[in-house]
Interface confidence: low
């Protein structure tokens, strides 16, 4: 590849914002490569040299009145100025999250399990996920990956509970997230669809067969029991 | 107390690359950047454009001020060039993943310097442009930069992919691996057992019960025609 | 397991076309990220690469030989043919094909090759 | 074409370590992964080393590859008279595929 020395020159101007603008703070800093040399922050009301390499910018800058005017209005005139024109798109977004669970891994029941509570697609990052075991909140055996930022204005999470599904047992996951008016639920049953259908369908059939079986052997042997001579020879002849 | 929200003025000037860039961060996503060789404002999201406009040709003013500042500072410095950190490098989906449903791989690549990375797509070892996408170069606290990659694909068991990032911190390309993770299917022991012992026990019955309830039923009607002895 | 042989005349006149096939077991070739290549090394001499085809039929060839060679697949017969125009006595060599599974750029399975020799 | 440099022949003692070196460009070696194969008397090639330092399953640890920048090398401790073989180093050049001139091994004593 290209070997050449490389030289990096990086200036960031930061708004911080408390309490939406009722408290406002201006830094604008230099850095070489990762190294900041000089700063202002508004809190200070002048340039202050970060590093050594930032002496000669924080005396030539002070020493400009025009500058640091400039440079102490700019909480108004650059920070409060822009969270105006951004905030319906910004500071107001909000991206209601979709939220799927599902077991990390197909293991049978009585087994330990990963339940993974997937939240994709919301924005602003603020979520609140919990887990609950037929209705009780568990705290153990947490685990989350954090808070995922997609680089689009979506954020994802993935939460995941360790535990060992029983028969019966339902697992739901809730999330808060500033873009609902009232909690998110999804549940997930101990067993699946297909073993559920697999159960109710063996059971039924089996029900079924017993009520014909009985209810055939009762018209038989009431018959029988009437009229014990007049039986036909032969099966079903 | 903790901040609620940040927006940042983030520019660069890289020698003896020549190249810049100049992009607003809110809370760490991009609102939008310049494109210096076009001179015009792209917004991260197409939206955005509705509600606010920015003027291109003010950036380029302040990519030259950043390319002169550098060069006094690289004087300063006695020429010290900048140390190579090389990237990590994340390949995650943006939803979950299911068979045949269109989804997009996302590349992340974090915590690198100099904002210069080689990044490809591979799809069975092939690479990939086909719908491909990718973020500027996005400012971290600690000054060192982040990217995004974007793969829209639809999810099969036939194919891997990996993110291919090649940077000057790294001994060679770094290449991450994704493939499709197909979930076995539980084997439902019990339930198969007691679903084939049901149907066949319940089978059995209805037809012995239906043989049973015929010969019942013509009993009867039998015993009706000859009459009492 | 996996298995390539090569098979082709052993010996070639001056200015001929030389064909050569490899046949092989134990893989496809429909199979997504496998390629085929073929690889010739002359007597007492190095290794030297000549021509790979992939799983999509995507062909790739020795800049100094293209235009010269061609290679081509057959996915059902498992068999992938190299031809070679206008042969030379400096292209006496032992040719050899082997498997590439693509991402790693390397040939993890040889053929035991077959030597043909160019003389008139 | 012979892309990668490598010296022509190595030696050593049964039980000493040699190293083979490979040295290559930006746009094969400094950009991609390098292999190593052994070549026995009379035999095809063999895959000894892949993705730079992995060993495929069979392949003794004695065989170790390393790379830096646009050079690879190959190491070989305690040599054995069945290591006396020659050895190449290959990488990929864009859509190419690219060999070292080889270097032949030998084992004293």
């Known amino acids: 590849g290209d070997t050449r020395p490389r030289f990096l020159e990086q200036v960031k101007h930061e708004c911080h914002f408390f309490n939406g603008t009722e408290r406002v703070r201006f830094l604008d800093r230099y850095f070489y490569h990762q190294e900041e040399y000089v700063r202002f922050d508004s809190d200070v009301g002048e340039y202050r040299a970060v590093t050594e390499l930032g002496r000669p910018d924080a005396e030539y800058w002070n020493s400009q009145k025009d500058l640091l005017e400039q440079k102490r209005a700019a909480v108004d005139t650059y920070c409060r100025h822009n969270y105006g024109v951004g905030e319906s798109f910004t500071v107001q977004r909000r991206v209601y999250p979709e939220v799927t669970v599902y077991p990390a891994k197909t293991q049978p029941l009585q087994h330990h399990n990963l339940l993974v509570c997937s939240v994709n697609g919301f924005y602003p990052g603020s979520i609140e996920v919990r887990w609950f075991r037929n209705g009780q909140e568990e705290k153990t055996g947490v685990v989350s990956t954090g808070l995922i930022q997609n680089g689009d204005w979506t954020f994802q999470t993935l939460v995941m509970l360790e535990t060992v599904p029983r028969s019966g047992e339902v697992y739901t996951c809730q999330v808060e997230h500033p873009s609902l008016t009232s909690p998110l639920t999804v549940e997930w049953r101990a067993r699946s669809e297909s073993a559920q259908s697999k159960m109710l369908s063996g059971v039924g059939g089996f029900v079924l067969g017993l009520l014909f079986l009985g209810a055939g052997l009762f018209i038989y042997f009431r018959n029988q029991k009437g009229h014990s001579g007049l039986q036909p020879t032969g099966f079903l002849s | 107390i903790k901040e609620e929200h940040v927006i940042i003025q983030a520019e660069f000037y890289l020698n003896p690359d020549q190249s810049g860039e100049f992009m607003f961060d809110f809370d760490g996503d991009e609102i939008f950047h310049v494109d210096m060789a076009k001179k015009e404002t792209v917004w991260r999201l197409e939206e955005f454009g509705r509600f606010a406009s920015f003027e291109a040709q003010g950036a380029l003013a302040n990519i030259a001020v950043d390319k002169a500042n550098l060069e006094i500072m690289t004087k300063r410095s006695n020429y010290t060039p900048i140390t190579n950190v090389p990237p990590e490098v994340t390949v995650l989906t943006n939803s979950p993943v299911e068979l045949r449903e269109p989804n997009v791989l996302i590349c992340f690549i974090d915590k690198f310097t100099p904002p210069v990375v080689n990044v490809t797509w591979l799809r069975n070892g092939k690479p990939v442009t086909t719908g491909v996408s990718e973020t500027v170069f996005l400012p971290r606290e600690d000054h060192l930069f982040r990217k995004f990659h974007y793969l829209p694909f639809l999810p099969s068991t036939e194919d891997v992919y990996d993110c291919r990032v090649e940077h000057w911190g790294l001994d060679e390309p770094l290449l991450k691996h994704w493939e499709f993770d197909a979930p076995s299917p539980l084997p439902e022991t019990t339930e198969n057992v007691v679903c084939a012992l049901g149907l066949t026990v319940g089978l059995v019955g209805i037809i012995i019960g239906t043989i049973f309830i015929i010969k019942g039923v013509r009993k009867s009607n039998a015993a009706e025609r000859r009459g009492p002895l | 397991q996996v298995q390539l042989k090569e098979s082709g005349p052993a010996l070639v006149k001056p200015t001929q076309t030389l064909t050569l096939t490899c046949t092989f077991s134990g893989f496809s070739l429909s199979t997504s990220g496998v390629g085929v290549g073929w690889i010739r090394q002359p007597p007492g001499k190095a290794l030297e690469w000549l021509a790979l085809i992939d799983w999509d039929d995507d062909k790739y060839y020795s800049t100094s030989l293209k235009t010269r060679l061609t290679i081509s697949k057959d996915t059902s017969k498992n068999q992938v043919v190299l031809t070679m125009t206008n042969m030379d006595p400096v292209d006496t060599a032992t040719y050899y094909c082997?498997?590439?599974?693509?991402?790693?750029?390397?040939?993890?399975?040889w053929g035991q090759g077959t030597l043909v020799t160019v003389s008139s | 074409d012979i892309v990668l440099t490598q010296p022509p022949s190595v030696s050593g003692a049964p039980g000493q370590r040699v190293t083979i070196s490979c040295s290559g460009s930006d746009s094969n070696i400094g950009a991609n992964y390098v292999t190593w194969y052994q070549q026995l008397p009379g035999t095809a090639p063999k895959l000894l080393i892949y993705?730079?330092?992995q060993r495929p399953s069979g392949v003794p640890d004695r065989f170790s590859g390393s790379k830096s920048g646009t050079s690879a090398s190959l190491a070989i401790t305690g040599l054995q008279s069945e290591d006396e073989a020659d050895y190449y180093c290959q990488s990929y050049d864009y859509d190419h595929y690219v060999f070292g001139g080889g270097t032949k091994l030998t084992v004293l004593g």
């Open positions: 082997a498997r590439s599974p693509r991402y790693r750029g390397a040939f993890d399975y």
């Open positions: 993705d730079n330092n």
